[in-house]
């Protein structure tokens, strides 16, 4: 019969014949022949292959380097890679979490719009009129100015984006 030009799913073409691919978690030892099946072997410890494949070497699990602030979020298996994440208070510097940096703080005059997560940094926003932040913080939002009126007081010093208003007693006219 005519040799095949294309093979079924989970097969590959070699020496004019279709051989079975190795399943995830296993690597290729030898191609099939007319008389023998494809020979596959399980990946070793700290190795994986995540697809049906004809790879002769398994991939090494990723190393989550503690010197770069990384820790294991999910341990790898023979079919999946290790997933790294950052230690508390740090966030990844790329999608694949190459390394970690400290969450940044929002300077005075800025408040936290979104608190940092393991994969994204703190998002700061300038305090709008009527709000202030007098601290550098990774979690404090902008605070509203004190309402002097509700305390039966008057504004003695206007607030800024970094300072609260200063309230004082009302000047009462003597009779």
């Amino acid at each position: 019969p005519e040799p095949p030009t294309a093979c079924r799913e989970k097969q590959y073409l070699i020496n004019s014949q279709c051989c079975s691919l190795c399943q995830p978690g296993q690597k290729l030892v030898s191609d099939c022949t007319e008389f023998t099946e494809t020979e596959c072997l399980p990946c070793g410890e700290s190795e994986f292959l995540d697809t049906w494949n004809r790879e002769t070497h398994c991939h090494q699990h990723k190393y989550c380097d503690p010197n770069l602030g990384l820790r294991v979020q999910q341990k790898g298996t023979s079919e999946t890679d290790t997933i790294c994440t950052c230690e508390e208070g740090w966030h990844c510097t790329s999608e694949a979490c190459e390394s970690c940096v400290l969450h940044r703080s929002c300077s005075p005059g800025f408040g936290v719009k979104q608190i940092a997560t393991g994969v994204s940094d703190t998002i700061c926003e300038p305090c709008p009129v009527g709000f202030f932040s007098n601290v550098s913080s990774a979690f404090e939002k902008c605070h509203p100015w004190t309402s002097c009126e509700t305390k039966d007081l008057v504004v003695q010093q206007a607030g800024t984006n970094k300072t609260d208003v200063v309230c004082g007693p009302q000047d009462r006219l003597r009779a």
Epitope: T93, E98, S99
Partner: antibody, heavy 112, light 112 residues
Framework: VKESEGGLFKPTDTLTLTCTAS????????MSWVRQAPGNGLEWIGA???????YYASWAKSRSTITRNTNLNTLTLKMTSLTAADTATYFC?????????WGQGTLVTVSS | DIVLTQTASPVSGAVGGTVTINCQSS??????LSWYQQKPGQPPKLLIY???NLASGVPSRFKGSGSGTEFTLTISDLECADAATYYC??????????FGNGFGGGTEVVVK
């Protein structure tokens, strides 16, 4: 990692380069494209993140597309509207700002 | 895009001596900076990552330091084989629409 052959292109042509990775899984790493014009420095084109997000330099954003095929373990760069200024050696590399594994690079020449 | 400004070329040093290359970033990139060595006709080679970490197989004569916007690569006990062009690369990533990446212009090191 190994890039596909570059070659000679005409202005306005579209460039498609493929990078094949072995011994590691593309889906676990950020992968970047970098180019270098003859006698010049390195220029970051863009990257695809481990989770599949795509990132481009502002000059490349409008005419570049980076994709990956995790089954074939390949990375592709497509760049449209080529000009002579795109003449360069194109590298694929593993990482984002820690490019620890580079291809040998492939020369792309754009000339009429 | 991030702009990285490197020490102007060339930088000269005698065998056994020390050279220093500076890299200044237009944005605060924390410690997210790498240094590469490139020789003619070859792809770049990672020397230092995360500002101060020595890449695998790189001799301890190479030392990286700095954080934020100012970074330095110091090569001590210079050898003839250190003659090359050195590049810094820096970036940050904080989600799909908040990122930056770029290379410095390169600094040629001449060993006398």
């Amino acid at each position: 990692v190994k890039e596909s052959e570059g070659g000679l292109f005409k202005p306005t042509d579209t460039l498609t380069l493929t990078c094949t990775a072995s011994r590691f899984s593309l889906s676990s790493y950020d992968m970047s494209w970098v180019r270098q014009a003859p006698g010049n420095g390195l220029e970051w084109i863009g990257a695809i993140g481990g989770a599949g997000g795509t990132y481009y330099a502002s000059w490349a954003k409008s005419r570049s597309t980076i994709t990956r095929n995790t089954n074939l373990n390949t990375l592709t760069l497509k760049m449209t509207s080529l000009t002579a200024a795109d003449t360069a050696t194109y590298f694929c590399a593993r990482g984002w700002t820690r490019l620890d594994l580079w291809g040998q690079g492939t020369l792309v020449t754009v000339s009429s | 895009d991030i702009v990285l400004t490197q020490t102007a070329s060339p930088v000269s040093g005698a065998v056994g001596g020390t050279v220093t290359i500076n890299c200044q970033s237009s944005e605060d990139i924390s410690s997210n900076l790498s240094w590469y060595q490139q020789k003619p006709g070859q792809p770049p080679k990672l020397l230092i990552y995360a500002a101060s970490n020595l890449a695998s197989g790189v001799p301890s004569r190479f030392k990286g330091s700095g954080s934020g916007t100012e970074f330095t690569l110091t090569i001590s006990d210079l050898e003839c084989a250190d003659a090359a062009t050195y590049y810094c690369q820096g970036g940050y990533w904080s989600g799909i629409s908040n990122f930056g990446n770029g290379f410095g212009g390169g600094t040629e090191v001449v060993v006398k």
